[in-house]
């Protein structure tokens, strides 16, 4: 095959090599860009900047090599359009720094920066951390800072991400209230800050105020839906990004729903309770306090992270006729109480021949501490059990 005369020539089925001296000053309009998985660039002293627009349309790119060229600056968002990039070789260029944002969101298996006149500063603290943690093949490169010695020896005591403090109201928040949150940002080289409010949706009317170093946020006319929703303050500097999330607890009264008993692995009387703060629960059977034990007990389903409503079961291990009757769930919090009742019939009484007669069962009206503790299961956590002595 005749040698390729162009600035960039195909290499394999989805690669491109650009090695003709000085032929490129940008990466616009590369041939077959949308299918490229590998791009090799060498000896391009006029290629000094790499920016977002340069790599637009290179969505399949896996390997990018720009070596022995004039690269001085790589924009923090340069690789936004190349999310699959896994190998990045920028060795032997004129790079003095590289922002942590440049590689954020990429899953780089390899990052090569040797042969650049790097300038040791807090802006390279992230790279020093990669070196310490053995990431991306960085340790093997033994990176040097120009005239300053090894990157590994760079002092980093003052290189911290911003510190955030979010002030939330101490007092109880009620439905319809306005809530003011303030995010205080401290740290060196602050660049940007803001609020992330994606979870809020219709939970409140949002008004932002102020800027660095003190950001304000007013949540007006809050609803109970605001509970369990994250309000996040973020800030960035040259070292990295910090985020702090808070939740505003909006008080509202207890509510409860009961559903028909269902036979699953065991029998279950399903319920839903809501309220903030979380209501305390108590079961009655035929009007008397139901003693919970290991044979009849309240069991909650895994809670949804972003809502206050809790679903669960009064679980009965293979109940008999003595369990037939009226079940009432009482829920109460400081803002109100609610109850719901349901009749459950599990089994006919083997000793009753007249189905019209009442079942002769009486229950102790005395409450016990046998329900102490919240039997909520939290996945992927070692649960700390409640321990109660009875007798």
């Amino acid at each position: 095959a005749a040698p390729c005369p162009d600035a960039c020539c195909p290499h394999g089925s989805s690669g491109l090599r650009c090695t003709r001296d000085g032929a490129l000053d940008s990466l616009h309009h590369l041939p077959g860009a949308e299918n490229l998985t590998e791009l090799y660039i060498e000896n391009q002293q006029h290629l000094q900047h790499l920016e977002l627009r340069d790599l637009r349309g290179l969505g399949e790119l896996r390997n990018l090599t720009i070596v022995k060229s004039g690269l001085r600056f790589v924009a923090p968002d340069a690789f936004h359009f190349t999310p699959r990039l896994s190998r990045l070789n920028l060795s032997f260029n004129a790079l003095e720094s590289l922002s942590w944002k440049t590689v954020q969101g990429l899953s780089l298996q390899e990052l090569v920066l040797s042969g650049n006149p790097l300038h040791c500063s807090c802006a390279l603290r992230w790279l020093q951390r990669w070196e310490e943690e053995g990431l991306g093949g960085v340790p093997e490169q033994k990176l040097q800072c120009h005239g300053q010695g090894p990157l590994a020896h760079m002092p980093n005591a003052s290189c911290g991400v911003p510190t955030l403090k979010v002030q939330v109201p101490n007092a109880s928040v009620d439905v319809g209230d306005d809530v003011l949150l303030r995010c205080q940002v401290e740290g060196r080289g602050l660049e940007q800050a803001g609020w992330i409010l994606t979870e809020l949706e219709q939970s409140a009317t949002v008004m932002k105020s102020g800027g660095l170093p003190s950001l304000g946020l007013t949540l007006a006319n809050v609803t109970s839906d605001l509970n369990r929703k994250n309000v996040t303050c973020w800030a960035e500097n040259d070292v990295g990004r910090a985020e702090v999330s808070v939740q505003v607890n909006v008080s509202f009264p207890a509510s409860v729903q009961l559903h028909t008993a269902v036979e699953m692995h065991h029998w279950c009387i399903p319920f839903s309770v809501d309220g903030q703060p979380a209501p305390s629960l108590r079961w009655l059977f035929n009007g008397s306090v139901l003693n919970e034990t290991s044979f009849i007990f309240t069991e909650f389903l895994e809670p949804a992270a972003n809502e206050t409503v809790r679903h669960g079961c009064l679980r009965l291990n293979q109940p008999t006729h003595v369990n037939n009757g009226n079940y009432t769930l009482l829920a109460a919090n400081p803002f109100g109480q609610a109850s719901a009742s349901i009749m459950a019939a599990f089994m006919d009484n083997p000793f009753e021949f007249n189905p019209e007669d009442p079942i002769p069962v009486s229950f102790s009206p005395v409450d016990t501490n046998s329900t102490s503790g919240d039997p909520v299961e939290k996945k992927d956590e070692t649960p700390f059990g409640v321990s109660v002595a009875v007798g």
């Epitope: 003693n291 044979f295 291990n317 003595v322 069962v361 229950f363 102790s364 016990t368 059990g385 007798g391």
Partner: antibody, heavy 116, light 107 residues
């Protein structure tokens, strides 16, 4: 087939410590409470306590509170009953049992003898 | 705690006889009574739960009855393999408690 298999009993000196194991198999371990019973000749059965592997909740008989500790390793579906300072009155047969329809499955038991 | 009292302590019967074992609770246990059979050198086995429901695989000669504080286990026709101690227990309220047992001997 539901099975409960106890182990760890034996002869221990007064003041010694011991941990009995109860290996459960053949059912969804975290779906049932598990109880421990003590049986001494002429004393009938005594309920020590029970616990729920799913949540870690435990209930102790007041007579045994502070004397024994129940614990569980969900990953190996095994329950434990532990003493830190054994007394002669702890000499007995110990059973673990599943709380299903009543205590519907029992282990074969393990004998603990506390004697010098 | 609720005290469960069983009577008699020992019973000697011939094969084929009918037997009734008694269990009394010191207070209402709402029908939450179980009966267990314990053969010599074996662990207890559940016979009856909820005062009257037979556990899986239990022969129908075993019948439980009663409510509130008085409960009985009836064996309609005693067999040689019924030689055992029989325990009643309440699981209505913590702490769960058991009776002292009734020992059934075969003549």
């Amino acid at each position: 087939e539901v099975q409960l298999l106890e182990s760890g009993g034996g002869l221990v000196q007064p003041g010694g410590s011991l941990k009995l194991s109860c290996k459960a198999s053949g059912y969804a371990f975290t779906n049932y409470w598990l109880g421990w019973m003590k049986q001494r000749p002429g004393h009938g059965l005594e309920w020590i306590g029970d616990f729920y592997p799913r949540t870690g909740n435990t209930f102790y008989n007041e007579n045994f509170k502070g004397q024994v500790t129940m614990s569980v390793d969900k990953s190996i579906t095994t329950a434990y009953l532990q003493w830190n300072s054994l007394k002669a009155s702890d000499t007995a047969m110990y059973y673990c049992a599943r709380a299903g329809t009543g205590f519907d499955y029992w282990g074969q038991g393990t004998t603990l003898t506390v004697s010098s | 705690e609720i005290v469960m009292t069983q009577s008699p302590a020992t019973l000697s019967l011939s094969v084929g006889e009918r037997v009734t074992l008694s269990c009394k609770a010191s207070e209402n246990v709402g029908g939450y009574v179980s009966w267990y059979q314990q053969k010599p050198d074996q662990s207890p086995k559940l016979l009856i739960y909820g005062a009257s429901s037979r556990a899986t695989g239990v022969p129908d000669r075993f019948t439980g009855s009663g409510s509130e504080t008085d409960f009985t286990l009836t064996i309609s026709s005693v067999q040689a393999e019924d030689l055992a101690a029989y325990h009643c227990g309440q699981n209505y309220i913590y702490p769960f408690t058991f009776g002292g047992g009734t020992k059934l001997e075969i003549k």
